[in-house]
């Protein structure tokens, strides 16, 4: 049976055993795997590898055996292992393969685990005595038997007949995502001072998770996913978002180099060597990761992760998964496969997608541009000197090469001709007896951001020109309109005449063509996240921040960004915490980035908020966010009450005191008032932000916040002996912006 | 002395609902995963459900047949399982039995409920 | 699913007969089967278990044999109180399957 590094199965035992014989025979190539569980409320067997040793834990009634295999015996390395225990008599034999391991005396008494046995894994047992147990089996065991009798036997769905082969798969296998819900969990991803991810990426799906860390602060991470068919990273951390995409359409069935960078000021995301990166805007402090590297699919924590997050993501897309397949997958520099996962779910070891994916003829056209990919420009004088032989035409005296290049000069987005002027050859052509056609052009590597666009029948396929087509304007330029000034293009140059000229240009010489893109500015745009309505609790405030609106400019770093609020300024709902009651008509994009800004309801229909953002040069089109304000619901969730020594004082925690609203993704004020005069004590609150030692004063009124932060108790201030349990009715009513639930 | 009391059954209209109810005493409850067994001429015996213990996070499997119908639960306070039944069809006529077992032997049963005879029709 | 097929679907035996009873898996059940007997109006109880292992209180005149795929269960000498109908069962994988039954009767 195949268990995934998720999984287990559960075995009844309803009656104390009072003999064991297990037989177990496991391969894992984990250091870590939970082999088996009894388990009872104190008695309980644990088998499980740990650091690659088997270690047996015994417990019975108050007495604790522990056995384990020696060191330098390593069971994790793949080969099927088998492990024998019994306890006969007062008296416990561990044997791995054959040999006597150890043995040891043992209480005579009957092992009670009315909890029943779990193979693999623990599933969701919570004991005192799990603590620090080994992860579950990724693995296969092949064999589980108790006095005789099969444990693996009814298999649950997620437990795979036999032994899936994906666990002895080298890492040059490739990751196969089968879907509907696969997934793959590694070692967390350090990115402490960068941090690289570089996989190659076969699929069709146009929307689907690539990877996930979450960070050690609630609320931070690192996604990458293909967003409409292109991939996109968005790094959340403390206040910041950053969203990055890149223009490579990648969901079309064909191998694309991928690789994320990430150091503390810069995030990249590069697809068949065609880099998008965040301007060096600061806000990637370092990310502590936390949990695993999820990679192809989410788990349920990650997908409420980024759906309480800024991205819009719905249900729908972050359960999704990928279907395609990851192969030369590394993290930080190193190889990672299969094997290594920590756990798997729906993944095949190998790259089988649908059928019609894999004819041999759909990568015959890739193989044809396989030379047009772009690559790291290889650091070399290009062209090489040619070196003329002997006995040639006077016109080749001191001939290294035929064409004096200049850089191609195109605007952001824009088209430019191909001239004379860019290729200039270094000899007079009629002396050298060589016709302008002659001179042939091939294109061996296009441009990262853009294309030669060829006016000439059938040359666009072949990608390639003669100078006679230069001179008649058939070659230009076309731009892809994206921010990077500096691009080239590859042209190798023969020429096809048959009269004496060296050698060189019958074999051809490859030269670089700088091109230079003249930026144009592009305006900025305004985007909702989570889409264009905002609700809020009528007279309460709501932080205004990017998880609300965002401000998209691909040439412009958030410092440059203004934001105006159009409209009449009188009664305008937009205000700076620190500034309450006075409207910001204007904000900057960093101030928005802080979260220092609020919108603030003070009855009637809400406003709707109409923004503009400029980048100092061009303005966005306006944008409106409708927000919709609705009546505070109050629901009293707990209240406990306190039981307390006379004279002693107790906290009001939540568990005993706390209410819930119809709030949307806003953490309201809410305020607890007391309405009626106290008998036996007092009500205090603790100044100074709740700093130890800080004094705890009187109060009749407190917020939710306050007893959340543990700065709220009740002191007992009676000082007469009673014959029975004094009983204080604390009456309270709860205020969230105008609304009040009394008699609580 | 084993005994598992069954109470619940009776005539319903297709489309409607029923909940049947399984006491059991003369064995610690809480520590025997429990099941639905139905039989009928047609279908002959035929598993239906199980929920399994606490520890277990009353782990819960259904026979496709009746997978989004039927609910099965459990209360160890009382010793009792319990088999709630929604959009009943003809199909689910047959006497139902609750049944038991608690031991790493197999999944056989190994202690019957008298059965209670459900019958759907207009 | 995994299904059961029993043989003979009845059985007309007398007292003092050696009966046997056959029970087919569709699929490789290894040993995880398991034998029932029901007589009219009552409960089925459990004969045997992981195909050939007495249940407690059985008669040591009903035994159980196989593996894999086709298993037997055996009356050495039938009573009276044995006329009924038996039942197979697996266990190896959900939905736990149960055969069409054996229904013996007095010849």
């Known amino acids: 049976a195949s268990f995934f590094g998720e999984n287990h199965l559960e075995v009844p035992v309803a009656t104390a055993l009072t003999d064991i014989d297990l037989q177990l025979q496991f391969s894992t190539s984990q250091p870590e795997a939970l082999l088996l569980l009894a388990a009872g409320p104190a008695d309980h067997l644990l088998l499980q590898l740990y650091s690659g040793r088997l270690q047996v834990r015994l417990v019975l009634g108050q007495e604790e055996l522990r056995l384990q295999t020696p060191a330098e015996t390593l069971l994790s390395d793949s080969i099927p292992h088998t492990v024998v225990l019994t306890v006969v008599e007062g008296w416990a034999t561990l044997s791995v393969d054959g040999f006597l391991n150890a043995s040891s005396a043992v209480p005579g008494a009957p092992l009670e685990v009315p909890y029943g046995l779990f193979v693999g894994g623990t599933g969701t047992l919570g004991l005192p005595y799990l603590r620090g147990t080994s992860r579950p089996l990724r693995g296969c065991l092949h064999a589980a038997t108790l006095n005789g009798r099969s444990l693996l036997r009814p298999l649950t769905p997620d437990v795979h007949e036999g032994c899936a082969e994906e666990f002895s798969a080298s890492d040059d296998v490739a990751l196969g995502f089968s879907g509907p819900h696969s997934l793959a969990a590694f070692p967390a991803w350090g990115t402490q001072d960068e941090g690289t991810l570089e996989f190659t990426l076969t699929t069709q799906s146009r929307q689907a998770p690539l990877a996930f860390q979450a960070g050690g602060r609630r609320g931070d991470f690192i996604y990458v996913d293909i967003f409409e068919g292109h991939l996109r990273a968005v790094v959340e951390k403390g206040q910041g978002t950053v969203l990055l995409h890149n223009s490579v359409p990648v969901a079309d069935g064909q191998p694309h180099e991928v690789s994320v960078h990430i150091n503390a000021h810069r995030l990249e995301i590069s697809v068949d060597q065609y880099p998008t990166h965040t301007s060096n805007r600061g806000v990637l402090s370092y990310l502590e990761p936390r949990g695993s590297l999820l990679l192809g699919g989410l788990d349920a924590e990650a997908s409420r992760h980024l759906q309480e997050h800024r991205l819009g993501l719905t249900p729908e897309a972050t359960n999704a998964s990928l279907l395609g397949c990851m192969e030369d997958l590394s993290v930080n520099g190193q190889r990672r496969g299969l094997r290594e996962a920590l756990l798997t779910r729906n993944m095949a070891a190998g790259c089988r997608l649908e059928e019609e994916e894999y004819e041999d003829d759909a990568y015959g056209h890739y193989e044809a541009f396989s030379t047009l990919a772009p690559e790291a420009w290889p650091a070399m004088e290009l062209p090489e000197p040619c070196v003329p032989e002997p006995g040639l035409p006077p016109v080749f005296a001191n001939f290294t090469q035929l064409l004096t290049i200049s850089p191609l000069v195109v605007a952001e987005g824009g088209t430019a001709w191909l001239e004379w002027r860019h290729v200039q050859p270094t000899l007079d052509l009629m002396e050298a007896e060589l016709r302008k056609s002659q001179v042939l052009f091939s294109v061996t590597r296009g441009a990262r951001h853009g294309e030669l666009e060829l006016d000439i029948p059938g040359a666009q396929a072949r990608k390639m020109f003669t100078l006679l087509d230069v001179v008649n304007r058939k070659a230009r330029f076309i731009h892809d309109g994206s921010e990077d000034t500096s691009d080239q293009l590859v042209l190798e140059v023969s020429v096809t005449a048959r009269v004496p000229m060296p050698s060189c240009l019958r074999r051809g010489q490859t030269y670089l063509l700088p091109i230079q893109v003249n930026p144009v500015n592009d305006p900025p745009h305004i985007i909702f996240p989570h889409g264009s309505l905002m609700v809020i609790l009528e007279h309460t405030q709501k932080p205004l921040g990017p998880e609300v609106f965002q401000a998209y400019d691909p040439d412009s770093a958030c410092e440059g960004l203004t934001f105006q609020v159009l409209g009449t300024s009188s009664g305008l709902p937009v205000e700076r915490r620190d500034q309450p009651g006075e409207p910001a008509t204007e904000f900057s994009c960093r101030e928005l980035e802080a979260g220092s800004l609020v919108y603030v309801h003070r009855g009637g229909p809400a406003q709707d908020l109409t923004f503009r953002v400029s980048d100092g040069l061009q303005a966005s089109p306006p944008a409106t966010l409708k927000v919709v304000a609705i009546r505070p619901a109050i629901q009293i969730h707990r209240s406990t009450g306190l039981r307390l020594a006379q004279g002693s004082a107790m906290p009001i925690l939540p568990a005993n005191l706390s209410v819930e609203t119809n709030a949307v993704g806003q953490d309201v004020s809410v305020l607890f008032r007391v309405t009626g005069a106290l008998q036996f004590g007092e009500l205090q609150k603790q100044g100074a932000g709740g700093v130890e030692g800080a004094e705890w004063w009187a109060t009749q009124a407190f917020h939710q916040r306050d007893v959340e932060q543990g700065r709220v108790r009740y002191l007992s201030t009676d000082p007469q002996h009673h014959a029975y349990d004094t009983v204080e009715n604390l009456a309270l009513e709860v205020q969230v912006g105008q609304e009040i639930l009394s008699n609580l | 002395q084993v005994k598992l009391q069954q109470s619940g059954g009776g005539l319903v209209q297709p489309g409607g609902s029923m909940k049947l109810s399984c006491v059991v005493s003369?064995?610690?409850?809480?520590?025997?995963?429990m099941n639905w067994v139905r039989q009928s001429p047609e279908k002959g015996l035929e598993w239906i459900a199980e929920?399994?213990?606490?520890?277990?996070?009353?782990?819960?499997y259904y026979a496709e047949s009746v997978k989004g119908r039927f609910t099965i639960s459990r209360d160890d306070s009382k010793s009792s399982a319990y088999l709630q039944m929604i959009n009943l069809r003809a199909e689910d006529t047959g006497i139902y039995y609750c049944t038991s077992y608690g031991n790493y032997v197999g999944h056989y049963f190994d202690h019957w409920g008298q059965g209670t005879t459900v019958t759907v029709s207009s | 699913d995994i299904q059961l097929t029993q043989s003979p679907s009845f059985l007309s035996a007398s007292v003092g007969d050696r009966v046997t009873i056959t029970c087919r898996a569709s699929?490789?059940?290894?040993?995880?089967l398991a034998w029932y007997q029901q007589k009219p109006g009552q409960a089925p109880r459990p004969l045997i278990y992981s195909a050939s292992y007495r249940y407690t209180g059985v008669p040591s005149r009903f035994s159980g044999s196989g593996s894999g795929t086709e298993f037997t269960l055996t009356i050495s000498s039938l009573q009276p109180e044995d006329f009924a109908t038996y039942y197979c069962q697996q266990y190896n994988s959900y939905p736990l399957t149960f055969g069409g039954g054996t229904k013996v009767e007095i010849k």
């Open positions: 699929q490789n059940v290894d040993t995880n």
């Open positions: 929920i399994r213990l606490k520890s277990n996070n009353f782990g819960r």
């Open positions: 003369g064995f610690t409850f809480s520590n025997y995963w």
